[in-house]
């Protein structure tokens, strides 16, 4: 029995003076305690608690129930402990079957003996089932066995308590062991759509999927830089013992522009923190933006081809396009299709091909596009290069030559005399009188030029040439004269390709 | 680190008795248990009987079971066994085992101990 100094209280003293008794079944369990400010007996068993305000706590037959420790308290607080064993070889065991285990972390199956003397007190599996190699234990026959370090392959493991009477195995009710999964790494948080873009009044939905050992983990939505509480509805499942996914939805049933800005989805476990954002934004009405991917002047070569390209952002959806040229939709020679098959695209490309173009093919050329919103368009001027033609070559009236032709870019017109029978014209002549004329074909036709010479210049028979010429190439026209005594006469103009 | 040390072995008389000892030095706790194994020459190392650091409770093989009994004394780091009745085919090298870790599942798996002491021989004549 404990012994204080005089003077300070305390702890009652117990009757039988022992930590532990046993007694049989049925015998009297009689405990006495003896203090002066006595206040209350408290029976404590497994979940299981009585209280007596007598000093003397009888129990006439003794049941295997009264088995646990019987603490006598004064009014100081202090209180003194016996633990009663009432060993009854028909119970050997009392039972609490719940049975929950923290991985890593011990837990107690709470199997107290009636008779703390027997032996190869221990655990068994069920229906001679094997328990795990690894699992250990610590025995204490007032509360039952401690597994040591929980695992996470222990849970749903069916096991007994069990101990050695007369040289056979006595086995407890049965206990399932339910593991609570211990958080080892950060929750998976992953986002239906990384980003939104929708117009004022309509719904924004944005899912975002938790994933973890167990239904403890904490998720919430939260808007950056904003304390405001979101509203969110949650969907839950567990996929087998240790796979727990939860659907955490947000809602804004109609968005406006103000709403815009990042979303964020955070989760956490007591491992650490794991978190995903989405990013809506919301414009007032619909847009088409279009960015051409060539110079929109083009310049091509005769009977080339080129490739009007043009990449367009368009919110909602583009309805319709179309290319046009000279008011005429082009039916074919074009595709149309999306930058991204990802869900939240709204960048497109359109490509119009245009093949073996001709001189006469030069022109604008517009893409339109529209969505339930918006009309844009987009103007590509394109120029077709082409090598001169001599339209007209002749001999006026007023004895002037005069040579017209037409090219794109505008062609450049020299003239040449060469005397007698030589073909090479080297000596040049300047013209009297040069003229841009104005075509009448479109405006990105090809460009006329006129040059005249006075041929009273010329006193020998010979030949004089007109050369028209520009960046693609040059062709030339020629002019025999001979002189019969004092006339001077035109032979036969002819023109000669020069390549 | 434990360190095991056996004492107690010797030629005892069938019927005789034998007390053996394994004191233990290093940290023991709440966790550990302490076990006597046996092995005869030509056989596997087989479990005789363990305790409890922390209760007290013991465990026994089937074939000692009522002659011999385990105890421990806390203070002096010691476990005894008590070999009563002993027979013929009791005779083998005792080994003292330990292990921090709590009792095993299957505490007669020599296989599950950490520790281990050098053994006694005790030899039982007819």
């Known amino acids: 029995q404990p012994s204080v100094s005089p003077g300070e209280p305390s702890p009652p003293s117990i009757h039988p003076g022992k930590s532990d008794l046993i007694v049989r079944v049925g015998d009297e369990i009689r405990l006495l305690c003896t203090d002066p400010g006595f206040v209350k007996w408290t029976f404590e068993i497994l979940d299981e608690t009585n209280e007596n305000k007598q000093n003397e706590w009888i129990t006439e037959k003794a049941e295997a129930t009264n088995t646990g420790k019987y603490t006598c308290t004064n009014k100081h607080g202090l209180s003194n402990s016996i633990y009663v064993f009432v060993r009854d070889p028909a119970k050997l065991f009392l039972v609490d079957r719940s049975l929950y285990g923290k991985e890593d972390n011990d837990t107690l199956v709470r199997c107290p003996l009636t008779d703390p003397e027997v032996t190869n007190y221990s655990l068994k599996g069920c229906q001679g089932k094997p328990l795990p190699k690894d699992l250990r234990f610590i025995p204490d026959p007032k509360a039952g066995i401690m597994i040591k370090s929980v695992k996470r392959a222990y849970h749903r493991l069916c096991l007994h308590c069990s101990v050695d009477q007369e040289g056979k195995s006595v086995l407890s009710e049965k206990f399932i062991l339910k593991v609570r999964p211990a958080f080892k790494a950060v929750p998976v948080v992953s986002v239906s759509k990384a980003s939104y873009l929708l117009r004022e009044g309509e719904e924004f939905t944005v899912t975002c999927t938790i994933k973890d050992v167990s239904s403890s983990v904490y998720s919430t939505w939260k808007r950056e830089n904003s304390q405001t509480k979101l509203q969110e509805k949650y969907n839950s499942w567990h996929h087998g013992d240790f796979n727990y996914e939860r659907q955490a939805t947000l809602t804004i049933s109609s968005a406006r522009v103000n709403d815009s800005g990042v979303f964020m989805c955070y989760a956490n476990n007591t491992f650490g923190s794991a978190n995903v954002t989405t990013t809506l934004e919301v414009v007032d009405k619909g847009f088409i933006n279009i960015f051409p991917m060539i110079n929109t002047t083009v310049f091509v070569n005769d009977g080339e081809n080129v490739d009007l390209i043009v990449e367009y952002e368009a919110f909602p959806k583009p309805e319709h396009q179309q290319w046009i040229y000279m008011n005429r939709t082009f039916t074919d020679k074009w595709e149309d299709y999306p930058k991204s098959e990802n869900e939240s695209n709204i960048r497109y490309v359109s490509e119009l091909h245009l093949t073996r173009l001709k001189g006469t093919e030069g022109g604008t050329y517009t893409f339109l596009v529209s969505n339930s919103d918006v009309n844009a368009a987009i103007a590509f001027n394109v120029y077709v290069n082409t090598k001169p033609e001599i339209l007209t070559y002749d001999r006026l009236v007023n004895g002037m030559l005069q040579c017209v032709a037409a090219g794109f870019p505008e062609p450049t017109i020299d003239w040449y005399f060469c005397p007698g029978t030589e073909q090479r014209c080297s000596a040049s002549v300047l013209p009297v009188d040069v003229q841009t004329l104005n075509s009448s074909g479109p405006p990105f036709g090809k460009l006329v030029v006129q040059s005249s010479i006075d041929s009273s210049a010329f006193k020998h028979n010979g030949t004089v040439e007109c050369k028209a010429y520009n960046d693609v190439g040059k062709t030339s026209a020629y002019f025999n004269f001979a002189f019969k005594g004092n006339n001077k006469e035109q032979i036969h103009p002819h023109t000669l390709f020069t390549p | 680190e434990v360190q095991l040390v056996e004492s107690g072995g010797g030629l005892v008389q069938a019927g005789g008795s034998l007390r053996l000892s394994c004191a233990a030095s290093?940290?023991?706790?709440?966790?550990?248990?302490m076990g006597w194994f046996r092995q005869a020459p030509g056989k596997e190392r087989e479990f005789v009987a363990a305790?409890?650091?922390?209760?007290?409770?013991?465990y026994y093989a089937d074939s000692v079971k009522g002659r011999f009994t385990i105890s421990r004394d806390n203070a002096k780091n010691t476990v005894y066994l008590q070999m009563n009745s002993l027979k013929p085919e009791d005779t083998a090298v005792y080994y003292c085992?330990?292990?921090?870790?709590?009792?095993?599942?299957?505490?007669?798996?020599?296989?599950?101990?950490?520790?281990w002491g050098q053994g006694t021989q005790v030899t039982v004549s007819s």
């Open positions: 085992a330990a292990d921090q870790r709590g009792v095993p599942a299957y505490y007669s798996d020599y296989a599950l101990y950490d520790y």
């Open positions: 290093g940290r023991t706790s709440g966790s550990y248990v």
């Open positions: 305790i409890s650091w922390s209760a007290g409770m013991t």
